[in-house]
Interface confidence: medium
């Protein structure tokens, strides 16, 4: 229904705390360089204004759209052009073009230092002194680094952060309590960030229809007892919610997400038997719980998929009458039977089925033509199954770090033109798939592996799009979202690449490496590995192993030496010479 004042309506629905959090996220995602203090001032002004509109919906400007109100606030920032350059040009536009312009200027790789977690004691002190400000900083720092982070989910992670600090800051060994718990929250949040970026990419590049197909497949896997119309209702709502968040309508997005959770909890009987535990929780936890819900049990009496979609004599008639609905029912029926498949695979199968009907229904004997379609699915199913098998075996053999290195070599050979930091980031993330998925039961491995890889590769595409350097990457990234992962998997060594000349300084290290945390040490070594491959793209596994082993020994030896600087200075050139020789 229409409201006189949109901002008053959202304030009342969301409550002050969530309203302020969401406004802070919105501003931080639009203007990623502004300090916290500047944003929090704007948030307070917007909140005060919203309160006046709650008191009197007819007050001046209360009837303006939220985009107009937010945009006017952002455009009033002094020195906007000095800090943001051409983003300031957006302010000359009218809504909705102005908001579109802001969205286009979101930076997926902002030039911000990595978020450093303070010492446990310092964290607890600032948390206890001002929890609201502490959590505000958290929202600001995450949102500006991840401008597409799903806002209501970020509020949930802030709540988790709050819980961990509340619990651990009373312990005697604060660090021992905080570190593993905050690491777990961080890991989940980083995965959530790449997953949501993939959803926004899907929406931006391929529109609502493609996203809705993704949602139908996902919902059908989770809720196999729900009827098709119920699944499409949920998919329609989820599509709307994601469109709003991806489009910067964070208040509407969070409000609609809460509404959907309410609907699901009121209609458990027609959706799933697994919802009750989620429905007893407060709003943020309820929505998150529902988003992560385990699959309901598949109905025992499901007939073969072939009955309606291959053997039925009216397949072509049903398809012709309403293509979208018929293909939707196919996707629903196939997905509810296959929680063990990735959504990407299910969408590839639906695409294959559609192409088969398009071809066969125009021929003289359609049933003979489409009669073998299910058998033709087999290679499409086998390909990702083999991918999971070989990669999980490799992960089990090498461990996470070794597996990351294998992936790094593979991807540097596929796309050596891509910048080393981007390759290292992608390989480290791709390599985490082992830890995340390979330890799961067999039936959960494929969906975990492929859908996670797709999200990570989307991040690679988003970064590459900013500065395109590899034709092969551009080709894989330009195609359909569901074909990306198979496209990258199929890439081989780029034969057109002219190897990088050997630069000694790239492989020159100093004693500062010794004091780095393990993760940073790994990144240094992986940076060197990528550079080695760029120098020698056809180096064998054994050659690379020799050089990297030598390098690890060198670092280890010099970090244990009494005069570290001297060791690095004298041993370094020897290492470089040996490496050149080993790779000759």
């Amino acid at each position: 229904e229409a409201h006189k004042s949109e901002i008053a309506h959202r304030f009342k629905d969301l409550g002050e705390q969530h309203f302020k959090g969401l406004v802070l996220i919105a501003f931080s995602q639009y203007l990623q360089k502004c300090p916290y203090e500047e944003h929090i001032k704007l948030v307070q002004e917007v909140t005060d204004f919203a309160k006046t509109c709650v008191a009197d919906e007819n007050a001046e400007n209360c009837d303006k759209s939220i985009h107009t109100l937010f945009g006017d606030k952002l455009c009033a920032i002094p020195k906007l052009r000095d800090n943001y350059g051409e983003l300031a040009d957006c302010c000359a536009k009218q809504e909705p073009e102005r908001n579109e312009c802001f969205l286009q200027h979101k930076d997926d790789n902002p030039n911000l230092p990595p978020f450093q977690r303070p010492e446990a004691e310092a964290m607890c002190t600032s948390f206890q002194e001002n929890p609201t400000s502490f959590l505000g900083h958290y929202l600001h720092e995450v949102a500006r680094r991840h401008p597409y982070f799903y806002a209501p989910e970020l509020l949930y992670y802030a709540e988790k952060y709050n819980e961990v600090l509340t619990q651990c800051c009373t312990e005697s060994d604060k660090a021992a309590c905080l570190t593993p718990k905050l690491d777990a929250v961080k890991e989940k949040a980083l995965v959530a960030a790449v997953r949501q970026r993939m959803k926004c990419s899907s929406m931006q590049r391929f529109g609502e229809r493609a996203f809705k197909a993704w949602a139908v497949a996902r919902m059908s896997q989770r809720f196999p007892n729900a009827e098709f119309a119920e699944i499409t209702k949920l998919a329609t709502d989820v599509t709307k919610i994601n469109k709003e968040c991806c489009h910067g309508d964070l208040l509407e997005c969070a409000d609609d997400r809460a509404e959907l959770a309410k609907y699901m909890c009121e209609n458990q009987a027609t959706i799933s038997s697994k919802l009750q535990a989620c429905c007893d929780k407060p709003v943020l936890q309820k929505s998150q719980c529902l988003a992560e819900i385990e699959h309901d049990n598949i109905p025992a009496d499901l007939p073969s998929i072939a009955a309606d979609f291959v053997e039925d004599k009216e397949v072509c008639k049903n398809y012709a009458e309403a293509k979208d609905v018929f293909l939707g029912t196919f996707l629903y029926e196939y997905s509810r039977r296959h929680p063990d498949y990735s959504v990407s695979l299910l969408l590839r199968l639906a695409k294959k089925y559609e192409a088969t009907l398009e071809k066969c229904c125009a021929e003289g004997d359609p049933p003979a033509c489409y009669g073998t379609v299910l058998a033709e699915f087999q290679p499409l199913v086998e390909e990702p199954k083999n991918l999971v098998k070989t990669n999980c075996e490799l992960y089990e053999k090498l461990g996470e770090y070794g597996f990351q290195n294998a992936v790094l070599v593979r991807y540097t050979q596929k796309a050596p033109q891509v910048s080393t930091p981007t390759l290292v980031e992608a390989a480290r993330n791709l390599g985490r798939v082992g830890t995340k998925c390979c330890t799961l039961p067999e039936a959960q491995r494929l969906p975990c592996v492929e859908d996670y890889l797709s999200a990570i590769l989307n991040r690679l595409c988003v970064l590459h799009e900013k500065t395109p350097v590899s034709e092969k990457v551009t080709k894989c990234c330009s195609g359909s979202l569901v074909e990306r992962r198979p496209c990258f998997s199929a890439l081989t060594v780029d034969e057109t690449y002219v190897p990088k000349e050997f630069k000694a300084e790239t492989f020159t290290f100093h004693s500062d490496i010794c004091t780095l945390p393990d993760k940073e040490k790994q990144i240094k070594k992986q940076t060197a590995l990528a550079e080695l491959v760029k120098h020698k793209p056809k180096a064998t596994e054994d050659q690379l192993k020799t050089v990297m082993g030598d390098f690890a020994q060198f670092v280890d030896k010099c970090c244990k030496a009494a005069d570290k600087d001297n060791c690095f200075a004298t041993e370094g050139p020897n290492l470089v010479a040996r490496s050149k020789e080993a790779l000759a």
């Epitope: 009827e227 119309a229 209702k233 329609t236 009987a269 309606d308 029926e333």
Partner: nanobody, 119 residues
Framework: EVQLLESGGGLVQPGGSLRLSCAAS????????MLWVRQAPGKGLEWVSV????????YYADSVKGRFTISRDNSKNTLYLQMNSLRAEDTAVYYC????????????WGQGTLVTVSS
Amino acid sequence: EVQLLESGGGLVQPGGSLRLSCAASGFTFDTSSMLWVRQAPGKGLEWVSVIHQSGTPTYYADSVKGRFTISRDNSKNTLYLQMNSLRAEDTAVYYCAKFPSSRMKFDYWGQGTLVTVSS
């Protein structure tokens, strides 16, 4: 016992409008998705439109998109089909049906109401 009673059919000129109603009883209407199907003389059943239990979303066969609107009033246990810009090829017996738990098959339908579009 499930009962579905359609009404509102009749003779109408091309370009004209009609509103069909379907009174439902014997099952929980507000938790059931519903649809309209039709059967033209000498032809098979063709589905026309589906509506979710809550009223949205709705789906239409390509042949009626933009001309027909399905709606429901859960407080009255009634399903509606507003038909505008009617064409000769819309001539058929229209049935309302309870949507099944899966697949585009129809669990129950009424006795139907005849719509004739002719000048």
